[in-house]
Interface confidence: low
Amino acid sequence: SAPGEDEECGRVRDFVAKLANNTHQHVFDDLRGSVSLSWVGDSTGVILVLTTFHVPLVIMTFGQSKLYRSEDYGKNFKDITDLINNTFIRTEFGMAIGPENSGKVVLTAEVSGGSRGGRIFRSSDFAKNFVQTDLPFHPLTQMMYSPQNSDYLLALSTENGLWVSKNFGGKWEEIHKAVCLAKWGSDNTIFFTTYANGSCKADLGALELWRTSDLGKSFKTIGVKIYSFGLGGRFLFASVMADKDTTRRIHVSTDQGDTWSMAQLPSVGQEQFYSILAANDDMVFMHVDEPGDTGFGTIFTSDDRGIVYSKSLDRHLYTTTGGETDFTNVTSLRGVYITSVLSEDNSIQTMITFDQGGRWTHLRKPENSECDATAKNKNECSLHIHASYSISQKLNVPMAPLSEPNAVGIVIAHGSVGDAISVMVPDVYISDDGGYSWTKMLEGPHYYTILDSGGIIVAIEHSSRPINVIKFSTDEGQCWQTYTFTRDPIYFTGLASEPGARSMNISIWGFTESFLTSQWVSYTIDFKDILERNCEEKDYTIWLAHSTDPEDYEDGCILGYKEQFLRLRKSSVCQNGRDYVVTKQPSICLCSLEDFLCDFGYYRPENDSKCVEQPELKGHDLEFCLYGREEHLTTNGYRKIPGDKCQGGVNPVREVKDLKKKCTSNFLSPEKQNSKSN
């Protein structure tokens, strides 16, 4: 879309009166402490708010919490603390909200020192009523719901027991001791690691990986010498210690741990780590840390089995284990990911891929921006996006990049325009085409959110001073209106809107401070009268995603197909509505070499689409471990990219021969696994 207008412009008629009639204030009868907010269910309008306040006394800390409930998207709240017997709720466990629209809520209470176990409050009617339950253990983690059945809960105890409930927390059973980490898999399966010699830390690299498919009646050991494990898409990953030294390697299973294959990834040493950046049912992005305290590593993308990996991006910024990475899945357009690299001069630059990691490029410079002081050439520079790393470095970045699957093409992020990320105060940029082009949307840092599937964008300036103004745009951030939502400014703490970006309500949270006291306050604004009518067919326009060259017959082809979307015209001021479904028309593309990744032992030279044999492997038989057997690979170097739907065109041939020999390097071969029943 054309740039040209960056500041406010007259657009929506009589919006002040319309918004004033739909602005709802709620002052919470609370001393300021911390506040947490959760939506219960989808499109139910139910919000739970937990406020907690700690009073440090001489010998101990006295805590008080209050629970509030709204059933109209935050316009009105009712104090329901009495439903939980005025008990102090532990905020570190948050509010455990059940999956989908189960209406289930679990709150974990603080209990006095000598008690036998913890206490929870359970609701299965969207927090209208709660049942108090005393636990036979002290929880170490929040209750975890099975994704398939919200009556099934698991939790770890402070004594490392794995506890399971089959009746939504009414009755609990310890199914295993000495457990370090537990996760739900598919079909109510639980995966967990156990230690033998005293503690999780002491046994790191000597843990066992277990599986139960019947909630603890029977178990199977599916891995030994385990350092850690993770689930991503349909893949189960384990990092496994090598026999001879302190290195470890990734093994992968696609059958819940029955059989394992060694991933063709570099091994890592004690100080290094692996990290699953993103995974779906087709493939996985894996980060492999560089040796030494470099702060970077390499991104690899997998084949459809999670075994063969292609190098995707070098010098990928990722600080120490559990540290920060800017890797972001742009959910508003298929195949798009954004992340940061650490360049040789230690500056940080943003990179984007439009084809699921096949190629990475810099972000195009916004047309309405100048290159900043980081740019060597004032006419040539890129947009660099602030994400988790910038936030961790306490730069003036209040929010990470934002995209929503139902707001097609829209990406909003803080950024700077130059040769690298700048420490100067950032501005907010928007892309309406999934990251191909960008426009400066707002000057200076802001909080932002998307409403009505992109029909409205709301923003609030990030300021240390109290605020009373909200900005909104009905044309994807081109033009902005400002609305004063209260006469008395508040210290702003957060914007809250229902997850999924379908709502037309936004809640502004903050606190008022007077000489004597400070109180939590929320303002909920409903934009329904700004978007007065429902959108009609004429309000939408056809948009070809990933279009870069309209003259090219294959324009828009990514991963073997192109998609045309019906998108709301920027000029249309109307409601997409809560039932809005993204309308897209896919069409299959002809295969080209771009639709194939390089097979094991092959690589793509820069700026070349052909896969060539790795020099060090030339003339050698390509052998690798698959399901615990050694495989002999006969290949011309190509393998179809996972999820690629192309047909016809070029079709490289590939063949795998089974050598029927055992893999000595596979620590997770089937005969090392055993089963037992309780």
């Epitope: 054309a2 500041e7 412009c9 309405n368 044309d475």
Partner: antibody, heavy 118, light 107 residues
Framework: EVQLVESGGDLVKPGGSLKLSCAAP????????MSWVRQTPDKRLEWVAI????????YYSDTVKGRFTISRDNAKNTLYLQMSSLKSEDTAMYYC???????????WGTGTTVTVSS | DILMTQSPSSMSVSLGDTVSITCHAS??????IGWLQQKPGKSFKGLIY???NLKDGVPSRFSGSGSGADFSLTISSLESEDFADYFC?????????FGGGTKLEIK
């Protein structure tokens, strides 16, 4: 009523300079982007330059880049076009145009004539 | 630059007729096109924006269609005040470019 009134057009020698103004009463000038567009004697239209509502951003056509400068004074509700190193091909009727939130040629002025001739 | 090819350059029509003017963009511009009217000796008036949207106050006998690279302006049941010059303009990317114009004359 929204109206735009251009002034400053004149006969000028090649290489000379001229400054055009566009007065913009009748609407909140500071919230709109503004453009200059010219119409040559053969009636062809050519977009010249655009400036954002706050004046932070300007864009030019390649034919005038480096010679013309678009600016605005929001306090005076006035848009300007400073033209220098004028050429005979700059001879045209110059119009200012308002960029609304919908699109970029929403309201037009009445025009002012610039003739570059020796 | 995007070249906007407008046709016809002129046409003679009668009152009450329906006419269509077309504009072809040298590359896809989605629906970032507007249509303008210029009466003899006068300035310009915006008629249509984003390809199909009628500007407030413009009679409903004017309509726009098309998207991508081919667009048209249709005027149904012509009235005397409609005899004027018409121009298309693309604002998909800088520099904004105009069609050569169509002169509508009374037959």
């Amino acid at each position: 009523e929204v109206q735009l009134v251009e002034s400053g057009g004149d006969l000028v020698k090649p290489g000379g300079s001229l400054k055009l103004s566009c007065a913009a009463p009748g609407f909140t000038f500071s919230t709109y982007g503004m453009s200059w567009v010219r119409q040559t004697p053969d009636k062809r239209l050519e977009w010249v330059a655009i400036i954002s509502s706050g004046g932070s951003y300007t864009y030019y056509s390649d034919t005038v880049k480096g010679r013309f400068t678009i600016s605005r004074d929001n306090a005076k509700n006035t848009l300007y076009l400073q033209m220098s190193s004028l050429k005979s091909e700059d001879t045209a009727m110059y119009y200012c145009s308002r960029s609304s939130s919908h699109w970029y040629f929403d309201v037009w002025g009445t025009g002012t004539t610039v003739t570059v001739s020796s | 630059d995007i070249l906007m090819t407008q046709s016809p350059s002129s046409m003679s029509v009668s009152l009450g007729d329906t006419v269509s003017i077309t504009c072809h963009a040298s590359q896809g511009i989605s629906s970032n096109i507007g249509w303008l009217q210029q009466k003899p000796g006068k300035s310009f008036k915006g008629l249509i924006y984003h390809g199909t949207n009628l500007k407030d106050g413009v009679p409903s006998r004017f309509s726009g269609s098309g998207s991508g690279a081919d667009f048209s302006l249709t005027i149904s049941s012509l009235e005397s005040e409609d005899f004027a010059d018409y121009f298309c303009v693309q604002y998909a990317q800088f520099p904004y470019t105009f069609g050569g114009g169509t002169k509508l004359e009374i037959k």
